[in-house]
């Protein structure tokens, strides 16, 4: 059983406030910022995590070339609007009534507009490409060992079903992890690839979202895998809609 039942903490999300006020005196944890109850047996949604963060004090061994429609999160942090299930609302606006549409991982997928901007649906990000560069090592990692270790990491630490880790590519020093998850593939209870990628990103940056102070320890046959650069590309089920002005800038 989890520490949440003993200490009343949330093993999977340190950005929570927990108290034994659930049914039968059970531990219940609420996300900072939104106050929404979270399930501490799985990952918290990226939307709620971003909201909590903003509320806190201030192979053929070939590498994948991201598609022309791939999005990179250049906008950085913002205080998002989340729906009752903790997902991003399709339309996000800031305090100055500037609005834009986002995908299921909260990344902007349209030009910015005003309050009249319509975002008809939350478009799903079905393919995530995590591009890593590792620090120099004595030799290259064995590709099959690296593949197995990263798949195990996503299964055990992030609780992501193995079928959603589509591929692990390696050309020293670049590692690429491909996550794929269509709407039709995602069953109730499955961790979302966007949430798993966000937890991984924060772990790699030394900003673990899990309870505790230890952080990520990733080794391949005993050799520490230390990442010095991370880029994440997001591909949506429907291509993004940006004006030509942005594309040629």
């Amino acid at each position: 059983h989890t520490a949440a039942q003993d200490n009343c903490t949330c093993p999977t999300n340190k950005m929570t406030v927990c108290s034994p006020d659930g049914p039968g005196g059970r531990c219940q944890c609420r996300a900072l910022g939104s106050g929404m109850a979270v399930d501490c047996s799985t990952l918290t949604s990226k939307c709620l995590l971003l909201k909590a963060r903003m509320s806190a004090p201030k192979n053929a061994r070939t590498l994948v070339r991201p598609s022309e429609h791939a999005l990179v999160d250049n906008d950085g942090l913002y205080d998002p609007d989340c729906d009752p299930e903790g997902r991003f609302k399709a339309r996000q606006c800031n305090q100055t009534s500037v609005c834009w549409c986002v995908n299921s991982v909260g990344v902007r997928r349209t030009d910015k507009g005003d309050l009249s901007l319509r975002c008809d649906e939350l478009v799903r990000t079905h393919h995530i490409l995590i591009d890593l560069r590792h620090r120099p090592t004595a030799g290259a990692f064995n590709h099959s060992d690296l593949d197995a270790e990263l798949r195990r990491l996503f299964r055990e630490r992030y609780r992501l079903h193995p079928k959603f880790v589509a591929a692990v590519h390696y050309e020293q020093p670049t590692i690429q992890i491909e996550l794929r998850q269509n709407t039709s593939q995602k069953a109730a209870g499955d961790v979302d690839i966007g949430d798993a990628a966000y937890y991984f990103e924060r772990d790699i940056k030394g900003e673990s979202l899990f309870q505790g102070r230890g952080g990520l320890d990733l080794r391949v046959r005993g050799e520490p895998l230390q990442v010095e650069r991370t880029l994440i590309y997001y591909l949506d089920e429907i291509p993004p809609k940006f004006s030509m002005k942005r594309l040629t800038a």
Partner: nanobody, 128 residues
Framework: QVQLQESGGGSVQAGGSLRLSCAAS????????MGWFRQASGKEREGVAQ????????SYADSVKGRFTISQDNAKNTLYLQMNSLKPEDTAVYYC?????????????????????WGQGTQVTVSS
């Protein structure tokens, strides 16, 4: 589903020895920070020892240094605590705990909040 099951507790005279075992399942045993904690009646849970099962680095509470030894058997997915020169003040319920898979140990101190999953505990009673 992470599961931990302690065994090996019991009653012993002061100066005696016991060996606690913790059978683990539901995660890759050699990729985690694992520890032993204890809770005496009416007192808070306190750290006893911890080890990163992938690297073997260990740390101990001052009160047990030189008397207790934490070890592991990766083939059996089992964590051990060898307790020698037991004292009456070692009387407590002993718990096995593990952090998130692939989580490093935090070595400055042994805090329950750094561990995510817990066993049910095994009673150790030391009489003088």
């Amino acid at each position: 589903q992470v599961q931990l099951q302690e065994s090996g507790g019991g009653s012993v005279q002061a100066g005696g020895s016991l060996r606690l075992s913790c059978a683990a399942s539901g995660f890759t045993f050699s990729r985690a920070c694992m520890g032993w904690f204890r809770q005496a009646s009416g007192k808070e849970r306190e750290g006893v020892a911890q080890v990163y099962t992938g690297g073997g680095s260990t740390s101990y509470a001052d009160s047990v240094k030189g008397r207790f030894t934490i070890s592991q058997d990766n083939a059996k997915n089992t964590l051990y605590l060898q307790m020698n020169s037991l004292k009456p003040e070692d009387t407590a319920v002993y718990y096995c705990a593990v952090g998130q898979p692939y989580g490093a140990c935090y070595y400055s101190d042994l805090a329950p909040a750094d561990f995510s999953y817990w066993g049910q505990g095994t009673q150790v009673t030391v009489s003088s």
